[in-house]
């Protein structure tokens, strides 16, 4: 059986392709060459006489071809445009006929693509997005790449045009890139140069740091407003609702009790038109923006009921503080027999009675912070001798 | 199956002119030459004239030249004689034959099929 | 151009051998080693025997094979049989302006 295979059978453009012959009979006057799937003497490319060992050029020669005393033809510089079948035509030394077909395909040397986008500068969760990889070429396919990734799986993104477009649907800041675009074909592979997208959004709700939230007089007050936003956002401070300056950071130096207020960042980006606005309060006082955990100490943490008496102590360093005593989430005193000395910081109960046994602690506080204890257990018992084991802490 | 088949053939008197017709099927037209031979009664084979596969070239025998003409209709498979000045000495049986030249060039085939042929009579 | 010189008649009993010759010049014969021979029986078309010199078409019989030698070129039928009786016309390739010439024909008689 005649047959006829392709050398390489994709063929890149330019190089060249051997259409070689398989079990050509052995006795022969000659064999042709056809454009197409079938014997067209308008469509010849070349005929070998076995006779003369000469070919003779047919309609179809592009001089580009050879043909070998083995039947086989090269094709050399190839073009699209020989893409197809080819026949070849054995005449037998008996004229009898006997035809193959084969086939062969050729692809471009791909250019290196390029993305085009129909908006470079979306803002985000509103705009759609689509690119494009140019150039549009036959036979090729379109892959593409986010983060040097393969596509992610995902609603918001959508491929059309045979793969050539690809949509991001209402953007977001994460999608800024870089996008690259790959186009591929049997013999060629080339890849773009990456592009970033430039997302509009924001301002975010601002941000302004330090935390603080309490200032000693004279100190100095610095405060800075950060939102996300692009393009950058435009920075305003406000006091007590009255405009001060049109900058990202506010200074006043050497604050008073004055200075206390409330404080508005205002940020706004011109580009999506949008504002956003964080407000601080700031209290500038003497007194410690944060009370110390005060330590609480009894005289005997296990008395006798009805006997004994017990002094509780609430101890603390800060200055300009108010204490309170609590016993089962009760305020104390709660009777004649408790009573509070030294400011408050000693609780004296006399005698113990039972319902007495428990757990207390104290709180200290001024009118900007407290702080509780931990909590102490007061064990009563009756007809017992009394244990001196000091502190116990519940 | 390769068949030839003559036609146009007849009774024509000196000076007149008849063309004849060959419908070829069962092979590749287009691919081979076409020829005509002719036959007087009694008389050998003389070879007439024959066309290229393309129809681009054309060849005649010394003593038709000027008077025949051979033509081909690729797309209907059809050869065509043209006879014109006709003389007492064409009275012949005319055969197509298959072959005479392959392809485009001019290498020499053989003929290796004919058609049945078709009588022409020049007589007043 | 002249027709090729071929013997008018061949005879030979069946099973015999039988050689018929074609001369030509060294413009035809000699000078292509394109000769045909062709068989052709009473009221019938000619048929391909024979083609460039040696070579065989298929469906025509072993019994028949061909030769040349300078000017002359020779068909020979072994093994004569009955249905090999007709005329035989020989032709070669002269140019490539007057591309053929027959030979003057040889009848063969199977005796």
């Known amino acids: 059986q005649l047959t006829t295979e392709s050398m390489p059978f994709n063929v890149a453009e330019g190089k060249e392709v051997l259409l070689l012959v398989h079990n050509l009979p052995q006795q022969l006057f000659g064999y042709s060459w056809y454009k197409g799937e079938r014997v067209d003497g308008n469509r010849q490319i070349v005929g070998y006489a076995i006779g003369t060992q000469q070919a003779t050029p047919g309609p179809a020669n592009s001089g580009r071809e050879t043909i070998y005393p083995n039947a086989s033809l090269l094709i050399q510089n190839v073009t699209q445009n020989d893409t197809g079948f080819y026949t070849l035509q054995v005449i037998k030394s008996d004229l009898v006929n006997e035809e193959a077909t084969g086939q062969f395909h050729v692809y471009p040397e791909l250019p290196k693509p390029s993305i085009s986008s129909n908006n470079s500068n979306p803002v985000e969760d509103k705009d759609a997005v689509a690119f494009t990889c140019e150039p549009e070429t036959q036979d090729t396919t379109y892959l593409w790449w986010i983060n040097n990734q393969s596509l992610p799986v995902s609603p918001r993104l959508q491929l059309s045009n045979g793969n050539r477009t690809l949509t991001l649907l209402s953007v977001t800041r994460n999608d800024t890139g870089p996008y690259e675009c790959e186009i591929q074909n049997p013999v060629s592979a080339n890849r773009s140069d990456p592009v970033t997208l430039n997302v509009t959004y924001g301002p975010d709700t601002p941000t302004i740091s330090p935390s603080d939230t309490y200032y000693r007089p004279g100190a100095n007050l610095s405060l800075s407003c950060y939102a996300a936003s692009n393009p950058p956002a435009q920075y305003s401070w406000l006091i007590n609702g009255t405009f001060q300056q049109s900058t990202q950071e506010l200074f006043i130096p050497n604050i008073t009790v004055n200075n206390s207020g409330s404080y508005t960042c205002h940020a706004n980006n011109s580009v999506t038109g949008c504002n956003r606005t964080t407000v601080k309060t700031i209290i500038v006082t003497e007194l410690s923006p944060v009370v110390a955990k005060p330590q609480i100490k009894a005289s005997k943490t296990t008395v006798t009921g009805d006997k004994d008496s017990v002094n509780l102590t609430c101890s603390t360093n800060d200055t300009g503080i108010s204490i309170r005593w609590f016993f089962k989430n009760q305020s104390l005193p709660s009777s004649e027999r408790m009573k509070l000395s030294q400011g408050n910081t000693t609780l004296s109960i006399n005698p113990v009675k039972r319902e007495d046994a428990g757990t207390y602690w104290c709180e200290v506080f001024n009118p900007i912070s407290k702080n509780q204890s931990d909590p102490i257990m007061l064990n009563v018992n009756y007809n017992a001798l009394p244990q001196e084991n000091g502190l116990s802490p519940g | 199956e390769v068949q030839l088949l003559e036609s146009g053939g007849g009774l024509v008197q000196p000076g007149g002119s008849l063309r004849l017709s060959c419908a070829a099927s069962g092979f590749t037209f287009n691919t081979y030459g076409m020829s005509w031979a002719r036959q007087a009664p009694g008389k050998g084979l003389e070879w007439v004239s024959t066309i290229s596969g393309s129809g681009d070239n054309t060849y005649y025998a010394d003593s038709v030249k000027g008077r025949f003409t051979i033509s081909r209709d690729n797309s209907k498979n059809t050869l065509y004689l043209q006879i014109n000045s006709l003389r007492a000495e064409d009275t012949a049986v005319y055969y197509c034959a298959k072959g005479g030249l392959l392809w485009f060039g001019e290498l020499p085939y053989p003929f290796d099929y004919w058609g049945q042929g078709t009588l022409v009579t020049v007589s007043s | 151009q002249s027709a090729l010189t071929q013997p008018a008649s061949v005879s030979g009993s069946p099973g015999q051998s039988i050689t018929i010759s074609c001369t030509g010049t060294s413009s035809d014969v000699g000078g292509y080693n394109y000769v045909s021979w062709y068989q052709q029986h009473p009221g019938k078309a000619p048929k391909l025997m024979i083609y460039?010199?040696?070579n065989r078409p298929s469906g025509v019989s072993n019994r028949f094979s061909g030769s040349k030698s300078d000017n002359t070129a020779s068909l020979t039928i072994s093994g004569l049989q009955a249905e090999d009786e007709a005329d035989y016309y020989c032709s070669s390739y002269i140019s490539t302006s007057t591309l053929y010439v027959f030979g003057i024909g040889t009848k063969v008689t199977v005796l």
């Open positions: 460039d010199v040696s």
